[in-house]
């Protein structure tokens, strides 16, 4: 793709704003970021060269105040204050606060339960295949295969304990070492970071908030591929992870510990078992080759059954075959042996809308794909629209200060040190990472939590996910223990390793800089979101999964080139950036390549004659389906019917520069006013949140 | 109750056939095998094959391999044992006994026996 | 095939003693032994099978045991109705393998 868009005839300079640069560019220059945001899609604006790295002024015809795109907006209070209100007017605000408290509860209630339904829609649609994936024998020599395997399966599913617990199975069972399951394992984590990066294209219908939020998701995406970048290689070449993990072990007598808590989904668990219910051992089944399971349905009928325990008289070929010396015998024509069999009775079927349509499982998990991605979007929407209600002057400054602010000086650096022991509680709480930075981004993007404060946040769940996995281990049965403990304990140690890596230095916090890059682009190329999210879980792993298929050299002969491509980009852009003059006069810029490799302009026109098509026909009953057409399309204007994103375009082309909708408005009621979402008499009487 | 009625006795001439029948009642004669034992006068038990009903399926013992063959109809309930190629040796009396397919618990019911007598 | 060897090849005891028939078999067999009671002129009839099990009627003075090659057939109290010669079978393999009887007497 294109290395460093759009860079025109400028010069080098790590000060301007580089569309593709993963940095955080100094204030100033970042006055010129959002002028240059605008593209054919928009009203004209100022354009504005990028200027030399020697210049001194940057003349430039702007509003003096344009924040930084990634400055938190302030969510101002335009209700009547509460020392104002008479009696009447306190009671009705104070039953209006609890009414939106219950509702912000109900629809983040339902936000989890959409993920849950999400997980086993995605288990019925791929799950047969994610139990394929790891029936493949080259993972056991191949850890870059083991890899893709990971992230393809978790994708697939959905969750990355389902696919870790295939795993341990498999290393209980002898089908696989732990040694060839550690990259898997890798690549789960990475695997169930697209959860979240989903939930953020839930919230593209603000470019400004979609900036955050997509930015916020995608920081867990980056500390994942890099962490493995670093230390898949590291693995390999040292197996330090399983050397750690090993010791702890066998140092250790364990004893049977208890069922890890499930504290979230005693709560979830009633409702979405009404949905569907799975299966989930069939996946495991046929991950370890059972025939049987390939033709069995992931669709949980009888949820009572009785288990017998019998034995029954089986024929063998001869009495060298027998199971039993002693249960054996023949009746002069057939040989006979006993064989314990645990005879299944069915008694009860489960309670779900799905039990009785005997659909195939393919067309159970479309349909709850669509109505999850659908409940899911809807809750979203309705909980950033309650939070931003409710987080409005004095609530929304406490709260960002709360979690924004960092001790006072000299324990500044225990901040974020407690974030992630935060995201590490909660994520236990919760029981799964998905859910938790899932919830986490939407509140970046209306901007209550920074980025900065969400990375340690997001690796704090990374870690709270694993300390589940350590106790569920502790739980297993006595032949499972050691192997789920270890492959537990892997994954542990794997998340430390990449927080050692990517949190302690700020100058190695590269997944905040990255995110930024990316959510900069996204925001600009909304279609770009979707390329990044297909490209990076599905195109990429599947590629590798191919290439390692056709074999080893196959593998190497792709992937040295391309590595070496990358590398080159890399050093050839960090030389641009900080000493160009010891560059070519051609290769201080990348004008030497042709536009389509160094700008996602022409890329864009492409997507947007491709979507051209559908423009017109874009139904949009809904704002769900808006947003879906906004990202889609990238043009607000074929949703004609639905006021969702038109408005705030029309308000954004009345400007000189090109605003962030909606921070520049006093206040979200005023800014959600323009976007015709909210009537204008509200926001008179909307009341302070107590 | 159960019950295995034989043919009667037979007098043979060396070289000649003989073919026993054994009529089954009492019982679900599918599900169980049709075994046949002979015992020459004085002499003990001496296994000569069997036959599950249901499917055909028969095992002779090595020495009456191609002399013997056990056959079932279902219809009536019968099995019949047909010895060729008598030789005086052959004297003896048949048994038609049942054994319960699938199971271990032996021949546990026996027809009263068939004499044969090869003599020239 | 699986050769049975009974012994003794008869035996004379006084009605109420015990009696104790053996039976070797030439290879294990496992507990795949059943034994036959065959009063003179009748027919053969199940008393034991699975070496230690007792067939339905049989009376309870009748006990079988042993496993793999050595197996005893047990009279604990000796009837004037149990004069009959005693066969033992294995059922372990192909071909069914009777031994050569144990004639039984009263005394």
């Known amino acids: 793709m294109a290395p460093w868009p759009e860079l025109g005839d400028a010069q080098p300079n790590p000060d301007k704003y580089l569309e593709g640069a993963a940095g955080q560019q100094p204030t100033a220059p970042d006055k010129s970021k959002e002028t240059n945001k605008t593209d054919n899609t928009e009203a004209p604006v100022t354009k504005i060269e990028l200027l030399p790295s020697y210049s001194t002024a940057t003349l430039i015809d702007e509003p003096t105040e344009v924040d930084d795109p990634w400055n938190l907006p302030t969510l101002q209070d335009s209700g009547i204050k509460w020392s104002e209100r008479d009696t009447k007017g306190k009671i009705l605000c104070f039953f209006q606060g609890i009414g939106r408290l219950i509702l912000l509860l109900g629809f983040l209630y339902f936000f989890v339960c959409s993920l849950d339904i999400l997980s086993s829609a995605f288990q019925l649609v791929g799950g047969k295949m994610a139990g394929q994936f790891f029936s493949n024998s080259s993972i056991m020599s191949n850890p870059l295969l083991g890899l893709v395997i990971g992230v393809l399966v978790t994708v697939l599913v959905q969750s990355s304990s389902t696919s870790t617990s295939i795993v341990v199975s498999m290393v209980s069972s002898s089908l696989l070492t732990v040694r060839a399951a550690i990259p898997i394992i890798m690549g789960a984590n990475i695997g169930t970071s697209i959860t979240n990066t989903i939930v953020a294209l839930m919230q593209v219908g603000d470019r400004s908030e979609f900036r955050r939020a997509f930015a916020g998701a995608t920081v867990h995406d980056f500390f994942n591929w890099l962490s493995v970048l670093v230390l898949l290689p590291v693995e390999v070449a040292t197996h330090y992870l399983e050397i750690i993990t090993q010791l702890i072990v066998e140092s250790f007598h364990f004893k049977n510990g208890e069922d890890a808590p499930d504290l979230l989904k005693v709560i979830t668990k009633p409702f979405t078992k009404l949905i569907v219910q799975l299966d989930k051992k069939v996946i495991s089944q046929i991950a370890m080759n059972d025939e049987k399971a390939k033709n069995k349905s992931l669709v949980k009928i009888w949820c009572k059954t009785f288990t017998n325990k019998t034995q029954i008289n089986v024929t063998v070929p001869s009495t060298a075959n027998c199971t039993s010396p002693s249960l054996c015998w023949t009746d002069g024509i057939q040989n006979w042996t006993m064989k314990n069999v645990t005879y299944k009775e069915n008694i009860a079927k489960c309670q779900h809308i799905f039990v009785n349509f005997h659909l195939p499982d393919l067309a159970v998990g479309t349909i709850l794909l669509i109505l999850s991605l659908l409940v899911l979007c809807g809750c979203l929407i309705m909980i950033v629209k309650i939070l931003g209600s409710v987080l409005k002057g004095q609530v929304a400054t406490v709260i960002k200060k709360t979690i924004n602010t960092d001790f006072p000086f000299p324990f500044a650096w225990l901040t974020g040190y407690l974030a992630i022991l935060v995201g590490a509680g909660m994520t236990f709480i919760v029981q799964s990472s998905s859910v938790f930075t899932s919830a986490l981004t939407p509140l970046i993007g209306i901007g209550v939590i920074t980025i900065e404060r969400a990375y340690p946040l997001t690796l704090g769940s990374n870690i709270g996910t694993t300390t589940t996995a350590i106790l569920a281990a502790l739980a297993s049965p006595g032949n499972a223990l050691r192997s789920s403990l270890q492959i537990a304990l892997c994954h542990f140690f794997f998340n430390i390793s990449g927080i050692l890596l990517w949190y302690p230095i700020p100058f190695t916090r590269l997944p905040i800089r990255m995110a930024k890059g990316l959510g900069n682009i996204s925001a600009k190329y909304r279609w770009f979101a979707v390329f990044y999210l297909i490209i990076f879980f599905f195109l990429i792993p599947l590629t590798v999964f191919g290439l390692s298929l056709a074999g080893w050299r196959v593998l190497v002969g792709v992937g040295v080139p391309v590595v070496f491509i990358i590398i080159l980009v890399l050093c050839l852009r960090l030389l641009q950036s900080r000493c160009p003059r010891v560059l070519p006069k051609k290769l201080q810029n990348w004008n030497f390549l042709p536009l389509w490799m160094r700008s996602l302009k022409p890329w864009d026109a492409v997507v947007s004659k491709f979507t051209g098509c559908f423009q017109m026909r874009c139904c949009c009953c809904c704002r769900v389906c808006c947003r879906a057409c906004c990202l889609l399309c990238d043009c607000p204007k074929c949703c004609r019917c639905s006021k969702c994103c038109e408005d705030l375009e029309e308000a954004q082309e009345g400007q000189d520069v090109p605003v962030k909708a909606p921070e520049t408005f006093d206040n979200i009621t005023i800014s959600r006013e323009a976007q015709g979402e909210v009537p204008a008499s509200d926001s008179k009487t909307e009341c302070t949140a107590l | 109750q159960v019950q295995l009625v034989q043919s009667g006795a037979e007098v043979k001439k060396p070289g000649s056939s003989v073919k026993v029948s054994c009529k089954a009642s009492g019982f679900f004669f599918t599900e169980y095998i049709i075994h046949w034992v002979r015992q020459a006068p004085g002499q003990g038990l001496e296994w000569m094959g069997g036959i599950i009903p249901n499917n055909d399926v028969t095992n002779y013992k090595q020495n009456f391999r191609g002399r013997v063959t056990i056959t079932a109809d279902e219809s009536t309930s019968t099995a019949y044992m047909e010895l060729s190629s008598l030789r005086s040796e052959d004297t003896a009396v048949y048994y038609c006994?049942?054994?319960?397919?699938?199971?271990?618990?032996?021949?546990?019911?026996w027809g009263q026996g068939t004499t044969v007598t090869v003599s020239s | 095939d699986i050769q049975m060897t009974q012994s003794p090849s008869s035996l004379s005891a006084s009605v109420g003693d015990r009696v104790t028939i053996t039976c070797t078999a030439s290879?294990?067999?496992?507990?795949?032994v059943a034994w036959y009671q065959q009063k003179p002129g009748k027919v053969p009839k199940l008393l034991i099978y699975w070496a230690s099990t007792r067939h339905t009627g049989v009376p309870s003075r009748f006990s079988g045991s042993g496993s793999g090659t050595d197996f005893t057939l047990t009279i604990s109290s000796l009837q004037p109705e149990d004069v009959a010669t005693y066969y033992c079978?294995?059922?372990?393999?192909?071909?069914?393998?009777f031994g050569g009887g144990t004639k039984v007497e009263i005394k």
């Open positions: 006994a049942r054994w319960r397919n699938a199971y271990y618990s032996a021949m546990d019911s």
């Open positions: 290879q294990d067999v496992g507990t795949a």
């Open positions: 079978q294995q059922y372990r393999t192909s071909p069914l393998t």
